[in-house]
């Protein structure tokens, strides 16, 4: 099972001589989960050349990948705490079939996609405690992210790895919203 | 490599509006986890933050300034603009652009422009 | 706000010794604590991130300690070029804050 970072990940932050606060460990937590998104992208760039293809829009079309909007309330204009973290859950929630995809894709880096999955549900499972309003996250439903998943592994090589190569810069990106707008918290 | 430069008035009369420019170069504003901010340093004082811009056009204002500032940016242009109305002498300073964040949207500024001393006079 | 305290403000010092600079924090601020190089008649410039992470390019003759609310900048062996004023930055939460500088002189 993943370490907490910032116990063990030598590469995020110093030692500490105090105890990190519940804010200071998901922070921790979310930059060990993007070094690990970090060395699977380089895997996929070295790989294909798919980080500097412009038809990403043709295979953005099939997928729904969460992003954070100004209406989600992690923004500074307009920021609300409890919206904010229902849609940080809920898309995390909804990017786990994704990362669910992504663990055949890699040959030299296998065991970094385990990691990136598993420390994401501990990532979860964090937030769920923090959530004050858990009656309004919405859970996807098991069959729809069976068949979405069976439909992703069908694409072609091209489309497989243009797919990987979104998913992880989308995950990336929300990620690093989730941080902002935790550090507000 | 990567360069931030600014641009504007030399000098600024009382109540005036100032206008910025920051033109960036070696990375695109549009990087996730990236942004720029704008710092001042007065002659013989220490900085202040006073304001930045990220990725997704996501901003955050000095409160002690905010009702005084604005910030935007230009993708295709590569430049960040920042308006501080209402000036006044004590807002006489060397005005910096930096860039910030990174991979963990650090609360760091790792490049800085060579400033643009602003001095405000009537 | 998060105010940050350096000490001392100046500091004369003769090259090859040791020089080591304070930043206290208000408040607790885990490792987010950063220091910039600010040489004179130029823009300043990170020298440590997080307390004690080096930066690429830095000399290793500098290096920060520190955690929570006590923060040290130390350069190991001063050389000429290293006069200018130091700065610690808060970039744990808003508003971003500096401490006032330490201007360190070569003898």
């Known amino acids: 099972a993943p370490v907490l970072p910032g116990e063990d990940s030598k590469n995020v932050a110093a030692p500490h001589s105090q105890p990190l606060t519940s804010s200071e460990r998901i922070d921790k937590h979310i930059r060990y989960i993007l070094d690990g998104i970090s060395a699977l992208r380089k895997e996929t760039c070295n790989r294909s050349n798919m980080c500097e293809s412009s038809k990403e829009a043709l295979a953005e079309n099939n997928l729904n990948l969460p992003k954070m909007a100004e209406k989600d309330g992690c923004f500074q204009s307009g920021f609300n705490e409890d919206t904010c973290l229902v849609k940080i859950i809920t898309g995390l929630l909804e990017f786990e079939v994704y990362l669910e995809y992504l663990q055949n894709r890699f040959e030299s880096s296998e065991e970094q996609a385990r990691a990136v999955q598993m420390s994401t549900k501990v990532l979860i499972q964090f937030l769920q405690k923090k959530a004050k309003n858990l009656d309004a996250i919405t859970t996807p439903e098991p069959t729809t992210n069976a068949s979405l998943l069976t439909k992703l592994q069908a694409q072609n090589q091209w489309l497989q790895d243009m797919t990987t190569h979104l998913i992880l810069r989308s995950f990336k990106e929300f990620l690093q919203s989730n941080l902002r707008a935790l550090r507000q918290m | 490599q990567v360069t931030l430069k600014e641009s504007g008035p030399v000098l600024v009369k009382p109540t005036e509006t100032l206008t910025l420019t920051c033109t960036v170069s070696g990375f695109s504003l549009s990087t996730s986890g990236m942004g720029v901010g704008w710092i001042r340093q007065p002659p013989g004082k220490a900085l202040e933050w006073l304001a930045h811009?990220?990725?997704?056009?996501?901003?955050r204002y000095n409160s002690a300034l905010k009702s005084r500032l604005t910030i935007s940016k230009d993708t295709s242009k590569s430049q960040v603009v920042l308006t501080m109305t209402n000036m006044d002498p004590v807002d006489t300073a060397t005005y910096y652009c930096a860039r910030i964040g990174g991979l963990y949207v650090d609360y760091l500024m790792d490049y800085w422009g060579q400033g643009t001393l602003v001095t405000v006079s009537s | 706000e998060i105010v940050l305290t350096q000490s001392p403000d100046f500091q004369s010092v003769t090259p090859k010794e040791k020089v080591t600079i304070t930043c206290r924090a208000s408040?607790?601020?885990?490792?987010?604590l950063h220091w910039y190089q600010q040489k004179p008649d130029q823009s300043p410039k990170l020298l440590i991130k997080y307390a004690s992470q080096s930066i690429s390019g830095v000399p290793s003759r500098f290096s920060g300690s520190g955690s929570g609310t006590d923060f040290t900048l130390t350069i190991n062996s001063l050389e000429a070029e290293d006069a200018a004023t130091y700065y610690c930055q808060n970039g744990h939460s808003f508003p971003w804050t500096f401490g006032q500088g330490t201007k360190v002189e070569i003898k």
């Open positions: 811009i990220w990725w997704d056009d996501d901003k």
């Open positions: 408040q607790s601020i885990s490792d987010y």
